[in-house]
């Protein structure tokens, strides 16, 4: 039975040209995490693997930095970065947990972080 909860940074906004940290936390389970995938729509951005460490997809190498922790930092944001991002936690023995973050990249300087929310 999957008892865990993913807490994410929720709906967030950031300025064009700036950077943003995407963060997910898995809690309420003693399942052990073996890998975390970060995806944008159907594109793989990065993987943090227990054995191999971080791997950033080649097409995102210049604009994506690993961390902090299991999070992901997006840099040099463009309006095209607006959209859904997913953290996918591969765990044993529970299986897969997925968290969703919606990022809006704004042209203006009015960019505020949304509240955190939880996905069971």
């Amino acid at each position: 039975m999957m008892t865990g909860t993913i807490e994410t940074t929720g709906n967030i906004s950031a300025e064009k040209g700036g950077s943003i940290i995407l963060q997910c936390h898995l809690s309420s389970t003693t399942a052990q995490v073996t890998q975390v995938n970060w995806e944008q729509q159907d594109q793989l951005l990065a993987i943090c693997n227990a054995d191999l460490g971080w791997h950033i997809s080649p097409s995102f190498k210049d604009r994506v930095a690993p961390g902090p922790g299991l999070g992901l930092t997006l840099q040099s944001l463009t309006v095209n970065d607006t959209g859904e991002y997913f953290c996918i936690y591969h765990t044993y023995p529970d299986g897969t947990y997925t968290g969703r973050i919606f990022l809006e990249v704004l042209e203006s300087s009015v960019a505020e972080h949304g509240a955190r929310f939880q996905i069971p």
Partner: antibody, heavy 119, light 113 residues
Framework: EVQLVESGGGLVQPGGSLRLSCAAS????????MSWVRQAPGKGLEWVAY????????YYPDTVKGRFTISRDNAKNSLYLQMNSLRAEDTAVYYC????????????WGQGTTVTVSS | DIQMTQSPSSLSASVGDRVTITCKSS????????????LAWYQQKPGKAPKLLIY???TRESGVPSRFSGSGSGTDFTLTISSLQPEDFAVYYC?????????FGGGTKVEIK
């Protein structure tokens, strides 16, 4: 150079409390999970508490659950273990130990601090 | 909880000897998803903190001499010291990090013959 320095050990009566500290240096403390591991006199090693890098997850074995609380202050590069309702069987050297994210072995250990529970 | 059983509990050996320590777990430490065995080996000298030697059952930690090697899979694991050196006399522990609570073997004390 990675350094973990424990403090706060001492003699305490059964039922008493003690707070251990671990000062970390030489690495990005907030990027690592941390644990406390203890060793009773002449005995083996026992893991007693775990905290994730950001402090949002904590785990304990049944032997200490409800009595021990692990916490951390990433701004101060410090790890803590609050021990309440202490028993004679909690007498041990307590080590803080570092863990790489997604890896749950202990890659660096402090030198330990001794806790003695006795009347 | 996963029980870790080490044998022997102690052994006497001479410098240059090949030493083998075994560790058995009460359930498999192999994750099928990544084919990794979640087992580590540590060395502890008197009055000192444990030191990581081996992780993933067979990967030597950086700076650990090549005479130390780990092998095994599933429930049966071995730590081998190919040619015992004076500084190797210590207590050795295996640890499973497959499932909570993480548990250690009882230790193997390697003494001078």
């Amino acid at each position: 150079e990675v350094q973990l320095v424990e403090s706060g050990g001492g003699l305490v009566q059964p039922g008493g409390s003690l707070r251990l500290s671990c000062a970390a240096s030489g690495f990005a403390f907030s990027d690592y999970d941390m644990s406390w591991v203890r060793q009773a006199p002449g005995k083996g090693l026992e893991w007693v508490a775990y905290i994730s890098d950001g402090g949002y997850n904590t785990y304990y074995p049944d032997t200490v659950k409800g009595r021990f609380t692990i916490s951390r202050d990433n701004a101060k590069n410090s790890l803590y273990l609050q021990m309440n309702s202490l028993r004679a069987e909690d007498t041990a050297v307590y080590y803080c130990a570092r863990q790489i994210l997604l890896r749950y072995y202990f890659d660096y250990w402090g030198q330990g601090t001794t806790v003695t529970v006795s009347s | 909880d996963i029980q870790m059983t080490q044998s022997p509990s102690s052994l006497s050996a001479s410098v240059g000897d090949r030493v083998t320590i075994t560790c058995k777990s009460s359930q498999s430490l192999l994750y099928s998803s990544n084919q990794k065995n979640y087992l580590a080996w540590y060395q502890q000298k008197p009055g000192k903190a444990p030191k990581l030697l081996i992780y993933w059952a067979s990967t030597r930690e950086s700076g650990v001499p090549s005479r130390f090697s780990g092998s095994g899979s599933g429930t049966d694991f071995t730590l081998t010291i190919s040619s015992l050196q004076p500084e190797d006399f210590a207590v050795y522990y295996c640890q499973q990090y497959h499932s909570y609570p993480w548990t250690f073997g009882g230790g193997t004390k390697v003494e001078i013959k």
